[in-house]
Interface confidence: low
Amino acid sequence: GELETSDVVTVVLGQDAKLPCFYRGDPDEQVGQVAWARVDPNEGIRELALLHSKYGLHVNPAYEDRVEQPPPPRDPLDGSVLLRNAVQADEGEYECRVSTFPAGSFQARMRLRVLVPPLPSLNPGPPLEEGQGLTLAASCTAEGSPAPSVTWDTEVKGTQSSRSFTHPRSAAVTSEFHLVPSRSMNGQPLTCVVSHPGLLQDRRITHTLQVAFLAEASVRGLEDQNLWQVGREGATLKCLSEGQPPPKYNWTRLDGPLPSGVRVKGDTLGFPPLTTEHSGVYVCHVSNELSSRDSQVTVEVLDPEDPGKQVDLVSAS
């Protein structure tokens, strides 16, 4: 006869490990007992359990409530045991020694491998600002046994670097993702992907990128000169910019206070019916936590009644 077993048994932390040991013999052969031992290079061989054809199962007190036979129906030639709720300390070599009649004794060894699936954590880097050089966007750490694989899944252009720290029973892997921040990256997902043989599927943690920036400011509203004549209503200047965080807008007049009746509403400066008093240099000041920008325009309100200021449409054409 011979023993049917496995060279390596692999389980995930907390699962039950089936240690296989089946005697394949002639029909008239019988298994008297199966002795299970833990084989430790330092502590030698320690009893785990004894399966006896008459006396039943005996379990070493150190493994009380943790070692069982597989549920019935059981083949009398099957000496397999279940090691409940495997922990990392269970990793190592195990031996089954089968005593048969009349063929004698057989033994086999196997290695139990306990996988510790990682629980990854993602840490964003320092605040990202447009104009910075290569900057840490995020780091992702995962510890497990064996060492997990940590990679990044993103459309964003960047570089990744990994480092490992080996502990007695596990390994921690940290991967960093560096990039050169630009406003186009705002809102883009950066996903840490952790792979491990103890995981049915990759674990993914997504970080949404936030890049602080402030665009140049410009002013719109002076395109149609006909709107800027004395008496016209509804004239406005609009300040154009964008940023993250969203910017605040402030309007001033370079050569004095804003004329009475002029209303500021966020990025827009609204004028009452125009008079020549509204002529002047207006400044839009845009700012957020990152920076500030200015844009200034000169408003000239024309008086059609003033011959000196009239436009000669004939010569202009």
Partner: antibody, heavy 123, light 107 residues
Framework: EVQLVESGGGLVQPGGSLRLSCAAS????????MSWVRQAPGKGLEWVSA????????YYADSVKGRFTISRDNSKNTLYLQMNSLRAEDTAVYYC????????????????WGQGTLVTVSS | DIQMTQSPSSLSASVGDRVTITCRAS??????LAWYQQKPGKAPKLLIY???SLQSGVPSRFSGSGSGTDFTLTISSLQPEDFATYYC?????????FGQGTKVEIK
């Protein structure tokens, strides 16, 4: 079809004992962690206790530690909650629920719940 | 223990409304967050697990979002059968803890 059926609730005096059972069917019972969650009348949900698939690990809320004992019999597909030294504030509907082990002591959310059994502690 | 703070504690809405419930954890819990629906006299029913994954058999009008400490449950178009109490629960650490619940009532 997954089914969890609680039983054993009833009226008990303060200081008394009660044993709740939860009969499971439709899934491999020993592969799942099991929990007890309670709900006092008109109140929210409160986790009480949990036990790993093998029964080797047990967990308790501080409010019941030392008074309640969770156990399971995987051969009978049954979860138990032994409740001793009962107090008025233990009055609640008690639900059993199942969850899967991910790794370490981290479990999934409870995807199936029983219909609950009412425990009333009053003199 | 991790505290879970849900808001609002109750809300009134009409059929077809978009409803949003928020849940805040007292410390980071990654995405170890579940949302449950409970109707009077019934057991809780799992709607969302892992913060944003829809449990099998749950209508797609339910959605979840968030990670870390701040989470949201959204019902895109409230249906008559959605009037119930909703709970968030963290299972990042033991003991797992629930929010105090949000009762969604008919306006």
């Amino acid at each position: 079809e997954v089914q969890l059926v609680e039983s054993g609730g009833g009226l008990v005096q303060p200081g008394g004992s009660l044993r709740l059972s939860c009969a499971a069917s439709g899934f491999t019972f020993s592969s799942y962690a099991m929990s007890w969650v309670r709900q006092a009348p008109g109140k929210g949900l409160e986790w009480v206790s949990a036990i790993s698939g093998s029964g080797g690990s047990t967990y308790y809320a501080d409010s019941v530690k030392g008074r309640f004992t969770i156990s399971r019999d995987n051969s009978k597909n049954t979860l138990y909650l032994q409740m001793n030294s009962l107090r008025a504030e233990d009055t609640a509907v008690y639900y059993c629920a199942r969850a899967e082990l991910l790794a370490f002591d981290v479990y999934t959310a409870s995807d199936y719940w029983g219909q609950g059994t009412l425990v009333t502690v009053s003199s | 223990d991790i505290q879970m703070t849900q808001s609002p504690s109750s809300l009134s809405a009409s059929v077809g409304d978009r409803v949003t419930i928020t849940c805040r954890a007292s410390q980071g819990i990654s995405s170890y967050l579940a949302w449950y629906q409970q109707k009077p006299g019934k057991a809780p029913k799992l709607l969302i697990y892992a913060a944003s994954s829809l449990q099998s058999g749950v209508p797609s009008r339910f959605s979840g979002s968030g990670s870390g400490t701040d989470f949201t449950l959204t019902i895109s178009s409230l249906q008559p059968e959605d009037f119930a109490t909703y709970y968030c629960q963290q299972h990042y650490t033991t003991p797992p803890t629930f929010g105090q619940g949000t009762k969604v009532e008919i306006k």
